[in-house]
């Protein structure tokens, strides 16, 4: 296994609709044709997997149907979008990239993006 540098923004603020997007960029040492991207959430020293996708270079990044993540890839950059976020989902979201093919296998883990989610204030009742 070889190490690989992964860069991602330090902080992102989710939209009022609970959507957060960020770019995960990896320093590929060669021409990888099979890449696995995983988003992990670290909160209170607990790490959980948010979503993962394997893609062949030049093809679309496809997550599972019930995934809260979507994404696109361009070269060594992956544009990730996480939706359905609420205030309780605030935390550090870590991008992990694995170059599965061709050998050798490379593993890169970013420092994480702190995503802040603020639940929108409920609209006040209107009297007509």
């Amino acid at each position: 296994c070889k190490a690989m540098h992964v860069a991602q923004p330090a902080v992102v603020l989710a939209s009022s609709r609970g959507i957060a997007s960020f770019v995960c960029e990896y320093a590929s040492p060669g021409k990888a044709t099979e890449v696995r991207v995983t988003v992990l959430r670290q909160a209170d020293s607990q790490v959980t997997e948010v979503c993962a996708a394997t893609y062949m270079m030049g093809n679309e990044l496809t997550f599972l149907d019930d995934s809260i993540c979507t994404g696109t890839s361009s070269g060594n950059q992956v544009n990730l979008t996480i939706q359905g976020l609420r205030a309780m989902d605030t935390g550090l979201y870590i991008c992990k990239v694995e170059l599965m093919y061709p050998p050798p296998y490379y593993l890169g883990i970013g420092n994480g993006t702190q995503i802040y989610v603020i639940d929108p204030e409920p609209c006040p009742d209107s009297d007509f």
Epitope: R36, T48, E49, T54, K96, Y105, I109
Partner: nanobody, 119 residues
Framework: EVQLVESGGGLVQPGGSLRLSCAAS????????MGWYRQAPGKQRDLVAS???????NYADSVKGRFTISRDGAKNTVYLQMNSLKPEDTAVYYC?????????????WGQGTQVTVSS
């Protein structure tokens, strides 16, 4: 705890065939690269063949056209079909799984199975 258990080794004549199997106790097939390595006496352990979750396959030059690696996710098993065996294929064959789980790099090895090619 993941365990890799190889089987199928043995003594075979030159030109013969064997099929090695590697059964995993945990479901590591969907996320990790599975491979076969071999180690001859007094030599280092070398990659024979590997297969990725996406089905991409890599072979050592010395076995191309003779060996075939495959996997069965339903059975959590990876296979190495070895045809046209030569005396220089004699070695202990090891199953390997490598990749990551959460933030940790993982690598698992089987205990090895002996393949001897001799007349």
């Amino acid at each position: 705890e993941v365990q890799l258990v190889e089987s199928g080794g043995g003594l075979v004549q030159p030109g013969g065939s064997l099929r090695l199997s590697c059964a995993a106790s945990g479901n590591i097939f969907t996320r990790n690269v599975m491979g076969w390595y071999r180690q001859a006496p007094g030599k280092q352990r070398d990659l024979v063949a590997s297969i990725t979750p996406g089905g991409n396959i890599n072979y050592a030059d010395s076995v191309k056209g003779r060996f075939t690696i495959s996997r069965d996710g339903a059975k959590n098993t990876v296979y190495l079909q070895m045809n046209s065996l030569k005396p220089e294929d004699t070695a202990v064959y090891y199953c390997n799984a490598h990749g990551s789980i959460l933030l940790d790099r993982i690598e698992y090895w089987g205990q090895g199975t002996q393949v001897t090619v001799s007349s």
